[in-house]
């Protein structure tokens, strides 16, 4: 089974996030609540579901988090846009993958992302966006951990 290729510079995304991480997390008014952080669901994703979960989480960030977040600091806003642009590029790659029928979404994968959306919905929209941005490193670490799965041909 050929795997999906994502040719994105993860180091660049992580670098951009590190530059804004402290400022974003300082605005988190619900430090004891998590949206992605302690998700066992992410840890037990099977190789077969990696593509689907990645696709769904990219959509979660691009369509919800980035759009809901209202950033008063222009410089931070610009960094977030750089990350968003990289995510768009990754989405494009995975779309091609889907067209080749290599990104099938099984129920377990759908359930995992539904939990994340449910967690997000439990918070006020701006608080949820801040928290999700602050937990971007969880998603990035997860992509890196599943690096072989996604990058190997």
């Amino acid at each position: 089974l050929r795997r999906c290729l994502i040719s994105t510079d993860m180091h660049h995304i992580e670098e951009s996030f590190q530059e804004i991480k402290r400022a974003i997390q300082a605005k988190d008014t619900f430090p004891n609540v998590t949206i992605l952080s302690t998700l066992e669901t992410l840890q037990i994703i099977k190789p077969l579901d990696v593509c689907c979960v990645t696709k769904n989480l990219l959509a979660f960030y691009v369509d919800r988090v980035f759009k809901d977040h209202q950033e008063p600091n222009p410089k931070i806003l610009r960094k977030i846009s750089s990350i968003a642009n990289s995510f768009l590029y990754m989405q494009k790659t995975l779309r091609q993958c889907q067209e080749q029928r290599q990104c099938h979404c099984r129920q377990e994968a759908t359930n995992a992302t539904r939990v994340i959306h449910d967690n997000y919905d439990q918070l006020e929209v701006h608080a949820a966006a801040i928290k999700s941005l602050g937990e971007l490193d969880v998603f990035l670490a997860w992509i890196n951990k599943n690096h072989e799965v996604m990058f190997s041909a």
Partner: antibody
Framework: QVQLVQSGAEVKKPGSSVKVSCKAS????????ISWVRQAPGQGLEWMGG????????NYAQKFQGRVTITADESTSTAYMELSSLRSEDTAVYYC????????????WGQGTLVTVSS | EIVMTQSPGTLSLSPGERATLSCRAS???????LAWYQQKPGQAPRLLIY???SRATGIPDRFSGSGSGTDFTLTISRLEPEDFATYYC?????????FGQGTKLEIK
């Protein structure tokens, strides 16, 4: 090399609206901020607002809130600035500018569009 | 909003002299959020300095920026005829982005 090309000069009547376009070429469009800056004759520079196309929502200076609309069309790499309820004080050169790395360090500028408001 | 105040309004100097332009912010802004622009009549502004002290691409090294907090300075070490223009500082720490009113550098 990034280039911003703006639409031509406009003469408008008081109370009407004007829509100025700014077409970008060379480089990514989606994740860079496009700002609109105006300069009345003999006056300084004034930031009106800006947009990062990927987000779709713009930020505006309070002075122009409700009267200006900034949009971006990612498919054509074009940003727009529409100013309504024009008055004679709106006579100015309107510039679009794209950031070079941070929202605000406007490294690339359009050639400017002169908007004259006169009855 | 952050108000940027430039001084002097006009500076009259001769080619070869050193020019020092000042920009003061109404509240503290970290150095990473300040830029300087040059504008000549009938032309669009040109970015000279970003992040208070980094020269933009193609800007000669006679231009230098410094400062932090509320006080920033643009220095032109040795004036060339083409340097006579109007200079603006800009803060981009927070919305709305705000320019100083400008300093006109004219030939004495």
């Amino acid at each position: 090399q990034v280039q911003l090309v703006q639409s031509g000069a406009e003469v408008k009547k008081p109370g009407s609206s004007v829509k100025v376009s700014c077409k970008a070429s060379g480089g990514t469009f989606s994740s860079y901020a496009i700002s609109w800056v105006r300069q009345a004759p003999g006056q300084g520079l004034e930031w009106m607002g800006g947009i990062i196309p990927i987000f779709g929502t713009a930020n505006y200076a309070q002075k122009f809130q409700g009267r200006v609309t900034i949009t971006a069309d990612e498919s054509t790499s074009t940003a727009y600035m529409e100013l309504s309820s024009l008055r004679s004080e709106d006579t100015a050169v309107y510039y679009c500018a794209r950031d070079g790395g941070d929202y605000g360090d406007m490294g690339y500028w359009g050639q400017g569009t002169l908007v004259t408001v006169s009855s | 909003e952050i108000v940027m105040t430039q001084s002097p309004g006009t500076l009259s100097l001769s080619p070869g002299e050193r020019a020092t332009l000042s920009c003061r912010a109404s509240q503290s802004i970290s150095s990473g959020y300040l830029a300087w622009y040059q504008q000549k009549p009938g032309q669009a502004p040109r970015l000279l300095i970003y992040g208070a002290s980094s020269r933009a691409t193609g800007i000669p090294d006679r231009f230098s920026g410094s400062g932090s907090g509320t006080d920033f300075t643009l220095t032109i070490s040795r004036l060339e005829p083409e340097d006579f223009a109007t200079y603006y500082c800009l803060q981009f720490k927070s919305f709305p982005l705000t320019f100083g009113q400008g300093t006109k550098l004219e030939i004495k």
